[in-house]
């Protein structure tokens, strides 16, 4: 399962698409800035096993996919870019699912500590709540787009876990 390479390639492609999706200048949205508190500290001190890293990455990508698959999202972004971005996310989810299957020989490793998954879900709930409060305004979506780019770039510790043999 050559995940580190395929994942970083797809991740880079997704980031490029996300960057291209920007429609308005981030500077015109400074008043809408928000602290979403990505659960970085929780992950930083933790040594992830391979299946656990896969599990958290899948959670982040699935939640991002959920967020960008809503009707409100369709109205906010250029359709062909949104579709390419969503397709990239879907391919990443497939890669991660297939990787768990290939880890069969070592799969007594638990998939994930529930606390990490809940931390990711709460983070995305905060994003969803923010969008609702801001009535899905163009600036709110711009703030969220920038936030997702940050969270995508973050996952250094998780990627280290992908290289590890369980």
């Amino acid at each position: 399962c050559d995940l580190p390479q395929t994942h970083s390639l797809r991740n880079r492609r997704a980031l490029i698409l996300l960057a291209q999706m920007g429609r308005i200048s981030p500077f015109s949205c400074l008043k809408d800035r928000h602290e979403f508190r990505f659960p970085e500290e929780e992950f930083d001190g933790h040594q992830f096993q391979k299946t656990q890293a896969i599990s958290v990455l899948h959670e982040m990508i699935q939640q991002t996919f959920n967020l960008f698959s809503t009707e409100d999202s369709s109205a906010a972004w250029e359709q062909s870019l949104l579709e390419k971005f969503s397709t990239e996310l879907y391919q990443q989810l497939n890669d991660l699912e297939a990787c768990v299957i290939q880890e069969v020989g070592v799969e007594e490793t638990p998939l994930m500590n529930e606390d990490f998954i809940l931390a990711v879900r709460k983070y995305f709930q905060r994003i969803t709540l923010y969008l609702m409060e801001k009535k899905y305004s163009p600036c709110a979506w711009e703030v969220v787009r920038a936030e997702i780019m940050r969270s995508f770039s973050f996952s250094t510790n998780l990627k280290k876990g992908l290289r590890r043999k369980d």
């Epitope: 299946t51 959670e59 959920n66 879907y90 989810l93 297939a98 768990v100 299957i101 998939l111 994930m112």
Partner: antibody, heavy 126, light 110 residues
């Protein structure tokens, strides 16, 4: 919680086609696949295929390729199963089924069927 | 393609007894992707156990799942009258996504 509501029973002639619909309501996401699973009278469950409504991506079981088409509308979230060149052995209850967004971790979510429709009986008879 | 074989085909037991149902795969299956369902006559299947051993919401703790590799089991510690039904195991494989069901084990009242 997701509710899946399927269309009513159908009686069809051999060689014809059938279209079954499945409307999802509740906590639905177009970013999770909707599958079709059938069950012949007194028999077991057989997965036929799935669609990811957000992208329209489909995957079909080998046994049905060439005869099956699954489509979906995103609003309201509805999946459709079309099966052509019907044979007597296609007589079955057709279920739509979907994963749960609440399963922790999400990587398990798409590997199972947490919610099922009530089933739609399709009878192939001459 | 993976084939799941369930045994026995039928299990005749009395309420209060324990039951062990087997699901054997033709090749290695990730236990994370092994699921069990219960189906009563005239009803849709109901999710019971997922990830090999996690109980779905509302499933009593008398139901437990285990196993790895090619051999999986569903155990019901003490059968209640409402437990009598057909039980199916199901695996997931990707890519491409394929869901495979066992042929089912019927647990009937003796």
């Amino acid at each position: 919680e997701v509710q899946l509501l399927e269309s009513g029973a159908e009686v069809k002639r051999p060689g014809s086609s059938v279209r079954v619909s499945c409307r999802a309501s509740g906590d639905t996401f177009s970013s999770y696949p909707i599958s079709w699973v059938r069950q012949a009278p007194g028999q077991g469950l057989e997965w036929m295929g799935r669609i990811l409504p957000a992208l329209g991506v489909t995957n079909y079981a080998q046994n049905f390729r060439g005869r099956i088409t699954i489509t979906a509308d995103k609003s309201p979230l509805t999946a459709y199963l079309e099966l052509s060149s019907l044979r007597f052995e296609d007589t079955a209850v057709y279920y739509c089924a979907s994963p749960s967004a609440d399963i922790i971790p999400s990587i398990l979510g798409t590997t199972l069927f947490a919610f099922w429709g009530q089933g739609s009986l399709v009878t192939v008879s001459s | 393609e993976i084939v799941l074989t369930q045994s026995p085909g039928t299990l005749s037991l009395s309420p209060g007894e324990g039951a062990t149902l087997s699901c054997r795969a033709s090749q290695n299956v990730s236990r994370h992707y092994l699921t069990w369902y219960q189906q009563k006559p005239g009803q849709s299947p109901r999710l019971l156990i997922y990830g090999g051993s996690s109980r779905a919401t509302g499933v009593p703790d008398r139901f437990s799942g285990g196993g790895s590799g090619t051999d999986f089991t569903l155990t019901i510690s003490r059968l209640e009258p409402e437990d009598f039904a057909v039980f199916y195991c199901q695996s997931y494989h990707s890519p491409p996504p394929v869901y495979t069901f066992g042929q089912g084990t019927k647990v009937e009242i003796k």
